[in-house]
């Protein structure tokens, strides 16, 4: 156990180790009564093992030399095993055009060099995603870049030179997305001091929703190591991580077609904005169009949403049907429309918050009604809510994580519908998953447009 020596050096190491594990691995110090050596030792040992495993060290459970060396290495202030501060906006930005602003400049570098380093760091991520970043000089940007020392206004103080170099917050409003750099470091354009570009690439990864990677070659590995910035490349792990959140550069699937032309139905990359049954038909929504598929018939037809429902907007984002009531609910942004017997009801749209969503929910990604339970599932970012249609209120205990309760689905979905009395069909990008909700597992993986005989 790590608490077996009384020398002052060893005691200092243990205290340092405790603080490190508290900060980065969720060790609860108040649950470590120093008098109860065995209890505290076991808790500590588990956390040391967790750290050693994550950082690729030999797993001994001891505060050995290599572990202490790693603990003293300069690193990012974001924890390795849980979120620094989860943001209400969820794990990703819900748009592809993202603004950033440099709040203040480090005196260690020329302003132009800071601008260049930050611009290039954003470029690293825009090169492998559909994201576009633009710098603004006034007003509220999505991502604020700040240089600060010590306590600097966010309840996560810096620690002087060395140790924590920077930290950043996941996507969201307010402090969400912001990246803070410790002014007590010496920021540089080269290998001396701490390279701003390399640190910024890492922190922007967090600003975009990535956590730490246990791959030592990844830029999202927690500790800082200089690499030649001229030959710098993201690792496969970094690319896999960011593309799982935003797709690849060609994949502007979440944005409408630039010219709003009819999407090609058999395009292998086709995704849908929303899907729902309406009686014996399935409606597939995309931009300002919808396809109508009559169950078990191969023929499909494309229509403009406005041709069927002139008062409805394009870009429907979620839809569900309560067949027994002949009702269809359509969602866009923070509004929803009610269609009864295929006719829009008057006095709509209404606010989605009337369902009981908290204020930070600004849009619904997908929705599905299950007639067996008379419940509607609303999917928002990486979470879902369950709504009781009889009592007209949210069920307690929600939201829950999609990945936790729908095995193999998530973290986010585009669309979902219910069919054949036991299946949900989940749509994620150009993929579709048939999910048996009784067995609680995926039973088939298909292309999103498989319903059209493509």
């Amino acid at each position: 156990l790590p608490l077996n020596s009384s020398t002052s050096l060893e005691k200092n190491n243990v205290l340092f180790g405790e603080r490190y594990l508290e900060k980065f691995y969720g060790l609860e110090i108040n649950k470590l009564p120093v008098t109860k050596m065995k209890y505290s030792g076991n808790l500590m040992k588990e956390k040391i093992q967790e750290m050693q495993h994550f950082l690729g060290l030999k797993v001994t459970g001891q505060l050995d030399t290599s572990t202490l060396e790693m603990m003293h290495a300069p690193r990012c202030g974001v924890p390795d095993v849980h979120h620094f501060r989860e943001m209400p906006g969820g794990p990703v930005w819900r748009k592809h055009y993202i603004t950033y602003r440099i709040n203040n400049y480090t005196p260690d570098m020329n302003r132009e060099d800071v601008d260049y380093a930050i611009r290039k760091a954003f470029q690293v991520w825009s090169n492998v995603t559909p994201l576009k970043f633009s710098k603004i000089n006034t007003g509220m940007a999505d991502i604020l870049v700040v240089f600060a020392r010590g306590a600097h206004g966010d309840f996560h103080a810096f620690d002087g030179k060395g140790g924590i170099l920077a930290h950043a917050f996941g996507p969201g409003s307010g402090i969400g997305g912001d990246a803070h750099f410790d002014e007590d470091e010496f920021w540089t354009t080269h290998s001396g001091g701490t390279n701003l570009f390399l640190t910024a690439v890492h922190e922007i990864g967090h600003s975009l929703g990535l956590g730490h990677s246990s791959d030592p070659k990844a830029v999202m590995f927690p500790t800082y190591k200089y690499v030649d910035i001229n030959t710098f490349r993201l690792s496969a792990d970094d690319i896999r991580g960011i593309q799982s959140l935003y797709g690849d550069p060609k994949e502007n699937q979440r944005l409408p077609n630039p010219d709003n032309s009819e999407p090609a139905l058999c395009d292998p990359n086709l995704s849908f904005d929303a899907v729902t049954t309406v009686g014996n038909k399935i409606f597939f929504f995309k931009d300002r169009f919808f396809w109508l598929k009559v169950s078990e018939r191969p023929k499909t037809s494309v229509n403009l949403i406005s041709s069927l429902w002139p008062t409805l907007p394009s870009g429907i984002e979620a839809a569900y049907e309560i067949e027994a009531r002949n009702q269809v609910f359509l969602f866009k942004d923070d509004k929803y429309w009610l269609i009864s017997n295929l006719r829009p009801e008057p006095n709509y749209p209404k606010s989605i918050h009337s369902f009981g969503f908290p204020n930070f929910v600004k849009k619904i990604d997908a929705a599905v009604f299950n007639p067996r339970f008379y419940r509607t599932y609303f999917f928002v970012d990486n979470q879902y809510w369950r709504y009781d249609e009889r009592r007209q209120m949210m069920d307690p205990g929600y939201p829950k994580l999609i990945t936790k309760n729908f095995q193999g689905i998530g973290p986010k979905i585009d669309a979902v519908f219910y069919s054949k009395n036991k299946y949900y069909y989940f749509f994620q990008g150009s993929n579709q998953f048939e999910y048996d909700f009784l067995l609680q597992r995926i039973t088939k993986t298909l292309k999103s447009n498989s319903w059209f005989g493509c």
Epitope: R85, E86, A151, G153, D154, H156, G174, P358
Partner: antibody
């Protein structure tokens, strides 16, 4: 609707104790730092104490340090302020407030207790 | 004695523009953004301006904030009777153990 509801205030003798609670609803409580701010009768606002989103980091005004303890239970969406060794000058309306990052301020306040 | 200094009161007539000043030091306003709060009679404070000059949604654009050096000011244009309230400036202060410091408050009367 985003709401903070304070409770637990009352009349107590000098040297006595009180525990204030603040029940949060309508938002994801566990992602926000939280603050207690007080206002003595006819006076201005005075920051009392703050706690980070996880509860791992706390701060206190010098005037209450060692006497007051801030805590939170994220599973119950509740913020607490345990006030011991109370003095006459602690008499005030106590507000709980959401947030407290220097750039973004305290954006939601309770009605006070 | 508040760490940030505000005039105790000010007044204006409907439609007028009024400004409220807030002065501090290098450890608070000099190094940190300023936030402004409005407290209507008998009500809890409400965030009016954050990060020196930004308005939360729902705050009318008649309210604007600015900061220069160790001073900040809140301007209210097109004054309305419902603007009668106490206004507080606030900022983090790194020289103190507790982060937030408030101004003493300014009572705005609409004549």
């Amino acid at each position: 609707e985003v709401q903070l509801l304070e409770s637990g205030g009352g009349l107590v003798q000098p040297g006595g104790s009180l525990r204030l609670s603040c029940a949060a609803s309508g938002f994801t409580f566990s992602v926000y730092p939280m603050q207690w701010v007080r206002q003595a009768p006819g006076k201005g606002l005075e920051w009392v104490s703050g706690i980070s989103s996880s509860g791992g980091f706390t701060m206190y005004a010098d005037s209450v340090k060692g006497r007051f303890t801030i805590s939170r239970d994220n599973s119950k969406n509740t913020l607490y302020l345990q006030m011991n060794s109370l003095r006459a000058e602690d008499m005030a309306v106590y507000y709980c407030a959401r947030g407290g990052d220097s750039l973004y301020g305290m954006d939601v306040w309770g009605q006070g207790t | 004695q508040s760490a940030l200094t505000q005039p105790p009161s000010t007044s204006g007539t409907p439609g007028q523009r009024v400004t409220i000043s807030c002065s501090g030091s290098g450890s608070n306003i000099g190094s940190n953004p300023v936030n402004w709060y409005q407290q209507l009679p008998g009500a809890a404070p409400k965030l009016l301006i954050y990060s020196n000059d930004l308005r939360p949604s729902g705050v009318p654009d008649r309210f604007s904030g600015s900061k220069s050096g160790t001073s900040a000011s809140l301007a209210i244009s097109g004054l309305q009777s419902e603007d009668e309230a106490d206004y507080y400036c606030a900022a983090w202060d790194y020289s103190l153990n507790g982060p937030w410091v408030f101004g003493g408050g300014t009572k705005l009367t609409v004549l």
